[in-house]
Interface confidence: medium
Amino acid sequence: QPDAINAAVTCCYNFTNRKISVQRLASYRRITSSKCPKEAVIFKTIVAKEICADPKQKWVQDSMDHLDKQTQTPKT
């Protein structure tokens, strides 16, 4: 779970070690603040749960990629 260290900054201290199905994911945001101990990705699931993940893991990259292309590629 992400931790808010103050109102403006949310950090991840641990990463999930389970791969989450992309069908369960609604969105993500990247954590790159120098106030945080590690760079991270926070996925929000379709049931609004937030999960910290390691951006260097390929399933995380692939999931971000999928979500990006879902929102950025015009639907035909």
Epitope: K56, K58, Q61, M64, D65, D68
Partner: antibody, heavy 117, light 107 residues
Amino acid sequence: QVQLVQSGAEVKKPGSSVKVSCKASGLTISHTYMHWVRQAPGQGLEWMGRIDPDNHNTKFDPKFQGRVTITADTSTSTAYMELSSLRSEDTAVYYCARGVFGFFDHWGQGTTVTVSS
Amino acid sequence: DIQMTQSPSSLSASVGDRVTITCKAFEDIYNRRAWYQQKPGKAPKLLIHGATSLEHGVPSRFSGSGSGTDYTLTISSLQPEDFATYYCQQFWSAPYTFGGGTKVEIK
């Protein structure tokens, strides 16, 4: 820290094959994608393809399809790129790189392959 | 393939100058681009990826901007160690493609 160490320079005859290795340390290669990029003398960078070492799925630039084989051995954390039917235009420096999405944050030192009769 | 056109192909500049390199993609790449620096005989080094993400350890004088098909790398105050060749790259879709490079030389 992450390090990618490649095999040494090669001189090959036209029509032959070359196999370049890339040994990774400081990372688990099954958690990442390993890519190969080449650079002909005085030229720009050209992406060749990549492997998912976990399941051996590969993706190539169609330009190299059928001539390049990318493999990986997770037990030794080593990726390999084999290029066959070599011609003089394949003379280049070949780099392995760790892929994040489709960009490359760690690179090997490069392997010079010279194709000459 | 998404073609990436980089300009200029070379430029001469002095230490302290502001330098701008541009890259044009032949279709929208949705900020999926990276910039690399390469010095002779060395492997490329990642500088910037995505919208504005500066790679760890890269000086803040380097910055990236742009959207859609047009992207820019800016060096706010050129330092002696910045004389090198710079490449843009798109990672919106495979095959991943690079610009032709911009060689930054000492004036």
